[in-house]
């Protein structure tokens, strides 16, 4: 019997054991977070699966993920949202220490999908473990990209108070309008709920003492945010290692000077 023809995409295929991984992560998350103990992980998986299974993987829409978003609805207290762009690891290290602040990946849906890839095939109930669409080479409306766009939009929409964003000062574009932060989250912060956006620009080099808050791309971010009637603040984090250390031990004498 000849194998059925399968669409070849440019990106890597679905992460192995994807259903088991999502289900296991969901169970673990709901065990650790008492406010999410009511979540039925089988229902969450069913809704996740329903978003992409049997659908052409270059024609996925935000609508497809709304049932999953509905089941994973979670609120972050005001002043506790941390966005990030091109500096995921440090952002996650920070929220692991500062437990009352939350990145998207600290929320159920972000936690479920973090670092995973998935896609299905049109008109079959199969998951494609061989290849999935690449955002650049194949299409932007693929299951993974649309998922992150959908949950990022929702995360930004529900933020309130002072919102923080961690930006990578080592990149040529510290603020990139094409990043998820620049293209989705910035535009979905609600001015009636968000008083201010505070950017933390993380320096890379040890001897880098420049004020990266004066960078043209940061000025561009300030302009976008100000036009949306949200105040903007910026801080340089010259020593990220010391910054994390001081979050862990704020009483340390060396933490009284600048970081």
């Amino acid at each position: 019997v000849l194998p059925r023809w399968r669409q070849q995409w440019s990106g890597s295929g679905t992460t192995s054991r994807f259903p088991e991984t999502v289900l296991a992560r969901c169970v673990k998350y709901t065990e650790v977070h008492p406010e999410m103990r009511h979540v039925d992980c089988q229902s969450v998986w069913d809704a996740f699966k329903g978003a992409f299974i049997s659908k052409y993987p270059c024609n996925i829409t935000e609508e497809d993920y709304q049932p999953l978003v509905k089941l994973g609805t979670q609120t972050v207290p005001c002043n506790k949202t941390l966005l990030w762009s091109r500096i995921k690891d440090l952002a996650h290290q920070f929220t692991q220490v500062q437990r009352d602040m939350f990145t998207l990946e600290d929320m159920l849906l972000g936690y479920l999908a973090d670092d995973l890839t998935w896609c299905g095939e049109f008109n079959t109930f199969e998951i494609n473990y061989q290849s999935c669409p690449d955002w650049r080479k194949d299409c932007s409306n693929n299951p993974v990209s649309v998922f992150w766009k959908t949950v990022s939009r929702r995360f930004a929409e529900t933020a309130c108070g002072v919102v923080h964003v961690m930006l990578n000062g080592s990149r040529s574009k510290i603020f990139d309008k094409n990043s998820t932060f620049g293209s989705v989250e910035v535009h979905n912060l609600q001015p009636e709920k968000v008083q201010a956006l505070e950017a933390w620009v993380i320096h890379g080099g040890r001897e880098d003492s420049r004020d990266l808050c004066q960078d043209p791309t940061i000025k561009e971010l300030e302009s976008i945010i100000s036009k949306r009637n949200i105040r903007f603040f910026c801080k340089n984090i010259y020593r990220p290692d010391k910054f994390l250390q001081c979050v862990k031990n704020p009483e340390d004498s060396s933490c009284l000077s600048g970081i």
Epitope: D40, Q42, S43, E63, Q66, V69, T150, R153
Partner: antibody
Framework: EVQLLESGGDLVQPGGSLRLSCGAS????????MSWVRQAPGKGLEWVAD????????WYADSVKGRFTISRDNSENTLYLQMNSLRAEDTAVYYC????????????WGHGTTVTVSS | QSVLTQAPSASGTPGQRVTISCSGS??????VSWYQQLPGTAPKLLIY???ERPSGVPDRFSASKSGTSASLAISGLQSEDEADYYC??????????FGGGTKLTVL
């Protein structure tokens, strides 16, 4: 044939209670989200409540939150709406509806059951 | 007050094409469905997932969605199309919401 059949509608006094039932047949009831939708006399459709396929999640319109409870018995293929603290403004025809793939639309509707709240 | 806005009435003569519109911010990121309610009967699904027709619905009924508005078009209008038409979607809280309904009169 795919069918939904509501029952339990009645005339009840303000502050009273009523339990509506909706029997399902012709489809795998336990695979689908279900909704209750109502229509006051001469008015439009108003969504009342939703329940997930396994019954573990429920959602309510603000107008009924805390007073109405949606539930289901998948072994009996039956959807319920327990209505407490009834008010005159709850007077309506109540429909149960099957949700097609969560949010595609409500593809099967019952014929409706009439609830009248009046003293 | 519905977050989906529909004109209260529309009319057309037999054979004509009529369009019923529905607008609301939640339409942007949620599927829209359309329902026909003939006098004294339960609603019937006409369109699901923005523009798809369930089997049995004549192809005279079509729909589209763009941004925060959606529309239902009925071509070759017939007397039996006289009914109330409702759009529905999920709102920003991801709960169902219906438009106020449009009463279609066939002149």
């Amino acid at each position: 044939e795919v069918q939904l059949l509501e029952s339990g509608g009645d005339l009840v006094q303000p502050g009273g209670s009523l339990r509506l039932s909706c029997g399902a047949s012709g489809f795998t009831f336990s695979d689908h989200y279900m909704s209750w939708v109502r229509q006051a006399p001469g008015k439009g459709l108003e969504w009342v409540a939703d329940i997930s396929a396994r019954g573990s999640n429920t959602w309510y319109a603000d107008s009924v939150k805390g007073r109405f409870t949606i539930s289901r018995d998948n072994s009996e293929n039956t959807l319920y709406l327990q209505m407490n603290s009834l008010r005159a403004e709850d007077t309506a025809v109540y429909y149960c509806a099957k949700n097609w793939n969560y949010n595609y639309g409500m593809d099967v509707w019952g014929h409706g059951t009439t609830v009248t709240v009046s003293s | 007050q519905s977050v989906l806005t529909q004109a209260p009435s529309a009319s057309g003569t037999p054979g004509q094409r009529v369009t019923i519109s529905c607008s609301g911010s939640s339409i942007q990121n949620n599927y829209v469905s359309w329902y026909q309610q003939l006098p004294g009967t339960a609603p019937k699904l006409l369109i699901y997932r923005n523009f798809e027709r369930p089997s049995g619905v004549p192809d005279r009924f079509s729909a589209s969605k763009s941004g925060t508005s959606a529309s239902l078009a009925i071509s070759g209008l017939q007397s039996e199309d006289e009914a109330d038409y409702y759009c529905a979607s999920w709102d920003d809280s991801l709960n169902w919401v219906f438009g106020g309904g449009t009463k279609l009169t066939v002149l």
